[in-house]
Amino acid sequence: MKVLQEPTCVSDYMSISTCEWKMNGPTNCSTELRLLYQLVFLLSEAHTCIPENNGGAGCVCHLLMDDVVSADNYTLDLWAGQQLLWKGSFKPSEHVKPRAPGNLTVHTNVSDTLLLTWSNPYPPDNYLYNHLTYAVNIWSENDPADFRIYNVTYLEPSLRIAASTLKSGISYRARVRAWAQCYNTTWSEWSPSTKWHNSYREPFEQHHHHHHHHHHH
């Protein structure tokens, strides 16, 4: 039994780091392998992660960690029974993938403006809380070419856009993801998407519609 692709890990900079690797053949990761991880200099016993299968030869392990300090460095030992397959280290602050934002809501109660809000995935005492910026993706369910990204570079988890910039009378979906420049993170996963119907009417169209209506009377 050998490691084909060495473990690579990313941290959410809060409580979980995820390590993935590939073996040289089909493996029952949870019964055959253990990933031991320990903070460098920590005097108490190493923690053990039981991996899960991630495809035939792939394994994934979710390492439970205390709130992360930027200088934290972990030793990683991958064992198959009594055999040490791989030894490495992992510094969470250098491999951050933020948690995905949540609670994405589209507020359509203001006639000419769409307000999108979402929740910051970190508590206020986490370093990333004040360092996230976001990308909002809006697309049309009817027209694959109607696909746009809005970069939100300020801290407030919200975006205002003119309803008139979207096509009227059709359904749109939106999703949001986050990253933090300070730790040169990767992008988070996208949030779950939310759907709404863009019923905005141009003022001229509204006027024209009303005029036509009266004409019928």
Epitope: L39, F41, L42, L43, S44, E45, D67
Partner: antibody
């Protein structure tokens, strides 16, 4: 309930030796790092010895290096501190403390045993 | 070794008041800092780790903050059981971890 109970303290002459013990209960002793911390009469705290969970790694400050030895017997759930070539400045209350599972802070302390070095 | 300097060495306060104790490290220790409380005649008790995370069972009137070299422990609405001595301790790097000199908090 986590309990750490120190014993072995007492009055000893300068240059003498003493061995302190700490009986641990209420947790899986063999998985925790342990330490000895002393509190001098002026109430200052000093970490005098640390040992990792399996006993393979120990550490001491310069003030006691070569004179103090920390050891553990995981089968007996007991931590030890062998002190030799004692000096008057070693007079203190000696506490046994357990290292937190996820950080090197000390989450449980014993009630302490008093060591007095005097002629 | 990294030196830890606590201030003030002592302070008097009344029940209900808010107090802040500070701890300064001689070099960057990131957030590798713990706080302990010691009542007269008792052993120290674990209060805070990682500079800001409360240990299990510690009341929310306690809060830790800071990183790098400057740290503080704040106690809101002091209770009678809060009086005693407080110590900071760093645990950065190899195990030559040092304590601050302590702060004695007395009832006014």
């Amino acid at each position: 309930e986590v309990q750490l109970v120190e014993s072995g303290g007492g009055l000893v002459q300068p240059g003498g030796s003493l061995k302190l013990s700490c009986a641990a209960s209420g947790f899986t002793f063999s998985t925790y790092g342990m330490s000895w911390v002393r509190q001098t009469p002026d109430k200052r705290l000093e970490l005098v010895a640390t040992i990792n969970s399996n006993g393979g790694s120990t550490n001491y400050p310069d003030s006691v290096k070569g004179r103090f030895t920390i050891s553990r017997d995981n089968a007996k759930n007991t931590l030890y501190l062998q002190m030799s070539s004692l000096k008057s400045e070693d007079t203190a209350m000696y506490y046994c403390a357990r290292f937190f599972r996820i950080r090197n802070a000390m989450d449980y302390w014993g009630q302490g045993t008093s060591v007095t070095v005097s002629s | 070794d990294i030196q830890m300097t606590q201030s003030p060495a002592s302070l008097s306060a009344s029940v209900g008041e808010t107090v802040t104790i500070t701890c300064r490290a001689s070099e960057n220790i990131y957030s590798y800092l713990a706080w302990y409380q010691q009542k007269q005649g008792k052993s120290p008790q674990f209060l805070v780790y990682n500079a800001k995370t409360l240990a299990e069972g510690v009341p929310s009137r306690f809060s830790g903050s800071g990183s790098g070299t400057q740290f503080s422990l704040k106690i809101n609405s002091l209770q009678p059981e809060d009086f005693g001595s407080y110590y900071c301790q760093h645990y950065y790097g190899t195990p030559t971890w040092t304590f601050g000199g302590g702060t004695k908090l007395e009832i006014k």
